[in-house]
Structure formats: C-alpha cells, structure tokens
C-alpha cells in the first residue's frame, strides 16, 4: 500500500538522519561522560526496535567541558526524540522475548555510539532490502 510504504520510508529517512547525529557525536566522544552504557550488539531478528529503545534510553551525557556542550546536548536530545510510529515497531512491541536493556553488555561512549550506528544501518538495510525498487518518492 503506497501511503504506508511512504510512511515507512519517512520513518527510515529519520533513522538515516540519526546516523548523522551519531557520527556528529562521535567527534565529541572525549567531551562525553565516560560512563558505561548498555550497548546492544548482534541484535536478533525482530528485536531491533527493542534494542533501539535501549540505545535511546541510555544516559549519554555531556561532561560539560569546553565550548562543545551545546552541540552535544542538542545532539543527544535529537537522538532521544521518539521516531514516528510504524507497524513494524508496533509489532515488535508485543514481542516479550527480547533481552532487557540491562542484559546487554555495557560499553563506554565511543563503542556505544558505534554499536548504535551499526543497529541503525542494519535497520535501514532490512528496510531497503525488503522493498521493491524505486526511491522514497516512487
């Protein structure tokens, strides 16, 4: 159905944007609190949205040093913004067998951001691999 696939595309474009925000934050990794955070890796199929919410819930924080504090805080806030709802996300919410956030290995900010980026890329890959050819406007 065209409108639902366009909705999915818009949703994935948002994921695409999140990758850039993660990349931006990676430039300021030395200005982040060096706290260990749950960082899902090798996420099992159908648990991607659960893992995504773990990344969003993590307490990534600026160390409040230097003049990068504002851009770091804005970037973190954007990472935590709730993406538009999709059927795939709703379906996965009902899946109770996904690991809890606390069960994932904790990593420092650098590895945390790298794993977050990998998950976002995996989600985009799954989305683009499952749809027919033609771009987001087709």
């Amino acid at each position: 159905h065209k409108s639902s696939s366009q909705g999915q595309d818009r949703h994935m474009i948002r994921m695409r944007q999140l990758i850039d925000i993660v990349d931006q934050l990676k430039n300021y990794v030395n200005d982040l609190v060096p706290e260990f955070l749950p960082a899902p890796e090798d996420v099992e199929t159908n648990c991607e949205w659960s893992a995504f919410s773990c990344f969003q819930k993590a307490q990534l924080k600026s160390a409040n040093t230097g003049n990068n504090e504002r851009i770091i805080n804005v970037s973190i806030k954007k990472l935590k913004r709730k993406p538009p709802s999709t059927n795939a996300g709703r379906r996965q919410k009902h899946r109770l067998t996904c690991p809890s956030c606390d069960s994932y290995e904790k990593k420092p900010p650098k590895e945390f951001l790298e794993r977050f980026k990998s998950l976002l890329q995996k989600m985009i890959h799954q989305h683009l691999s499952s749809r027919t050819h033609g771009s987001e406007d087709s």
């Epitope: 595309d9 474009i13 695409r16 944007q17 850039d20 990349d23 970037s75 985009i124 683009l128």
Partner: antibody
C-alpha cells in the same frame, strides 16, 4: 514534484560575504535535511554541511567550519547558506540538495564569482 | 575521511554500448554508496542509491552493484542523453565524500 530553486549567479568582492538561497517546493520541507555541496570550475564535488529544517540543527564539514553558516526559514520553505570572508578559492558553484536515503533532488546551483 | 576513487576520469564509448564505471572506497562502506549524473549544463541527478536501488524516474538501463569497498555503475545500452559526468558518493560516515567523477564521451 520536488523542486529546489537557486539563483543563477552572484558576483562579490573579496573579503565580503554572500548569502544564497534555496527555495524548496513539492514536499514537506521539515521532513528532509538539506545538504550543501561546492563545485569548483572543472572539479569534483565537495560536501559543505547539512541542516535539519525542523529545528535548525547543523553539521558542518571540518573544511567549512567558520566559512559557511546554514540557516532556514520554515515559513517560506527556504534554506540559506552564508559564506563569509570570501577569497578567490570560494569562486564555485554551490548546490543545495535534499537528503532522503541519498541527495535525491538537487538545485540548479548558484555560481559565485569572487572578484574585485 | 573516507576516500572514494574513480580510477577512470574519462571514458569513450559508442551509442548502444554497455558501459561500467567503478568506484573504490578507502574502507568498507556497507553498501551506503550512491551514484549521481551531472549533465553538461551542470544539472545533477540521483541515479542509484544504496548501491543498487534505482531512484524514481531513472531509466532501467542504469544499474548498480557492489559491496564492501568496490562498487560499479552500469549503463546497459548507452544513449546520447547519457553523455555526462558520473560521481559516486558515500553515505556511510560523515563527512559525506564524493569520487572525482568519470566523464563519459561518445566515440
């Protein structure tokens, strides 16, 4: 259909600034980030930076920090790029491009000539 | 920064030919590779995104393939309107970077 309209050319003095526009139509302006790209005569393409029109969040290439400033006017669906302290190195064509999964729609480019 | 190398800067072909343009990345870019066409009048258009996805309105004679660090754009049946410069671009990591371009000319 998606369109990005840019003025054709700008002639500016060395040391001055120039603010170029990119008027978007045919889609929801705030749903897509806008990227800017530089092309020197006979050269390749160089990424300048991007802006999220929904909240003015910007990311710049290291090469253009302090040189380019990206802004938007949501009410007119227009993105702007200000280039400051212009030198002959800034003489180029500057493109705006909407970013979905890629830079899927491009403006025609604004040709900036820096000359006294 | 990720470097993209288009080893062939210019290419001559005849109408109807099958043409392949290559692009190599300095590191694995996980298929986040796009192809653009710049026509002689300066107009830039997206052809292919995410290695092999055809952008809407692009003729099916254009196709893309590749993985890891090596990617290619193929035009299966060259037409006059395909005379242009073709750029690859990676969307894997900031900053966005482009290949140097491959200019396609008619023999």
């Amino acid at each position: 259909q998606v369109q990005l309209q840019q003025p054709g050319s700008e002639l500016v003095m060395p040391g001055a600034s120039v603010k170029m526009s990119c008027k978007a139509s045919g889609y929801i302006f705030t749903d897509y980030w806008m990227h800017w790209v530089k092309q020197r005569p006979g050269q390749g393409l160089e990424w300048i930076g991007t802006i999220d029109p929904s909240d003015n969040y910007t990311i710049y290439s290291q090469n253009f920090k302090g040189k380019a400033t990206l802004t938007v006017d949501e009410s007119s669906s227009t993105a702007y790029m200000l280039l400051s302290s212009l030198t002959s190195e800034d003489s180029a064509v500057y493109f705006c491009a909407r970013y979905g999964f890629a830079m899927d729609y491009w403006g025609q480019g604004t040709s900036v000539t820096v000359s006294s | 920064d990720i470097q993209l190398t288009q080893t062939t800067s210019s290419l001559s072909a005849s109408l109807g030919d099958r043409v392949t343009i290559s692009c190599r990345a300095s590191q694995d870019i996980s298929n986040f590779l796009n192809w653009y066409q710049q026509t002689p009048d300066g107009t830039v258009k997206l052809l292919i995104y995410y290695t092999s996805r055809l952008h809407s309105g692009v003729p099916s004679r254009f196709s893309g393939s590749g993985s890891g660090t090596d990617y290619s754009l193929t035009i299966s049946n060259l037409e006059q309107e395909d005379i242009a410069t073709y750029f690859c671009q990676q969307g894997h990591t900031l900053p966005r970077t482009f290949g140097g371009g491959t200019k396609l000319e008619i023999k």
